[in-house]
């Protein structure tokens, strides 16, 4: 036998308490689906949470994070604090990444450089704590020999005029 | 407190017409399915019509085609219209408020005290 509460809309309950009739949700809650016996408490966005979406009878609030916060978790269920590009959050607060790591996010953790020489290419820009290293192109590439539709221009190194 | 009034019932000729309406009071009326039933002499209450929120309409054999059903949110009330009335539609005829907005086998959480439709030459 069918459920005498299927057909209850979204944004109401099934009353038990009324013979199980559809009554409303009561405010500040709601019901996302139909047949619902019960109304759930809408989420409350307090603190470094903040309202994105109100609350209605058929769906929850949505919540974001105040400036210099962002959200983790599904559907922002926590704020953690921004740092700055060329930083990390630690327990102890932002730091800056160490020699050979960059962050070029206000989230997330310091990464290493791309390492050039495994690809068999040269550093074409340094790495900093913000941005990663710029590969060139390799040696072979730069063989007057190599078939190249637009060969790449010399890369020029420190200290040492073109030939 | 959930009540359902109902009025417009009395005597007509057979192949006539009447219309009786249920005034509904104490409950979220545009939510809820409502339902007609009626219970002739001697018989078993029986379905007659009833109408969901979303207005879907269901309505028993014996009266299809001849009894309509509709509702007024704004008025928080329930009709039913009949027409081509015949000596067994006689019967004392109830306002039903219906389970979980439910009109496919429906179920009566709320009763009204009924009104006497006599047919009869």
């Known amino acids: 036998l069918q459920d005498p509460c299927s057909n209850c809309p979204a944004g109401t309950f099934c009353d038990n308490n009324r013979n199980q009739i559809c009554s409303p949700c009561p405010p500040n809650s709601f019901s996302s689906a139909g047949g619902q016996r019960t109304c759930d408490i809408c989420r409350q966005c307090k603190g470094v949470f903040r309202t994105r979406k109100e609350c209605s009878s058929t769906s929850n609030a949505e919540c974001d994070c105040t400036p210099g916060f962002h959200c983790l978790g599904a559907g922002c269920s926590m704020c953690e604090q921004d740092c700055k590009q060329g930083q990390e959050l630690t327990k102890k607060g932002c730091k800056d990444c160490c020699f050979g790591t960059f962050n070029d996010q206000k989230r997330g953790i310091c990464r290493p450089w791309t390492n050039c020489s495994l690809d068999g290419k040269s550093v074409l820009v340094n790495g900093t704590k913000e941005r990663d290293v710029v590969c060139g192109p390799s040696p072979a590439d730069l063989s007057p020999g190599a078939s190249s539709v637009t060969p790449p221009a010399p890369a020029r190194e420190p200290g040492h005029s073109p030939q | 407190e959930v009540q359902l009034l109902e009025s417009g019932g009395g005597e007509v000729q057979p192949g006539g017409s009447l219309r009786l309406s249920c005034a509904a009071s104490g409950f979220s009326f545009s939510i809820n399915a409502m339902g007609w039933y009626r219970q002739a002499p001697g018989k078993r209450r029986e379905f007659v019509a009833a109408?969901?929120?979303?207005?879907?309409?269901v309505y028993a054999e014996s009266v299809k085609g001849r009894f309509t059903i509709s509702r007024d949110n704004a008025k928080n009330t329930v009709y039913l219209q009949m027409s081509s009335l015949r000596a067994e539609d006689t019967a004392v005829y109830y306002c039903g408020l219906l389970k979980g907005n439910r009109v496919v086998s429906p179920s009566v959480a709320y009763w009204g005290q009924g009104t006497l439709v006599t047919v009869s030459s």
């Open positions: 109408i969901e929120s979303g207005r879907n309409t």
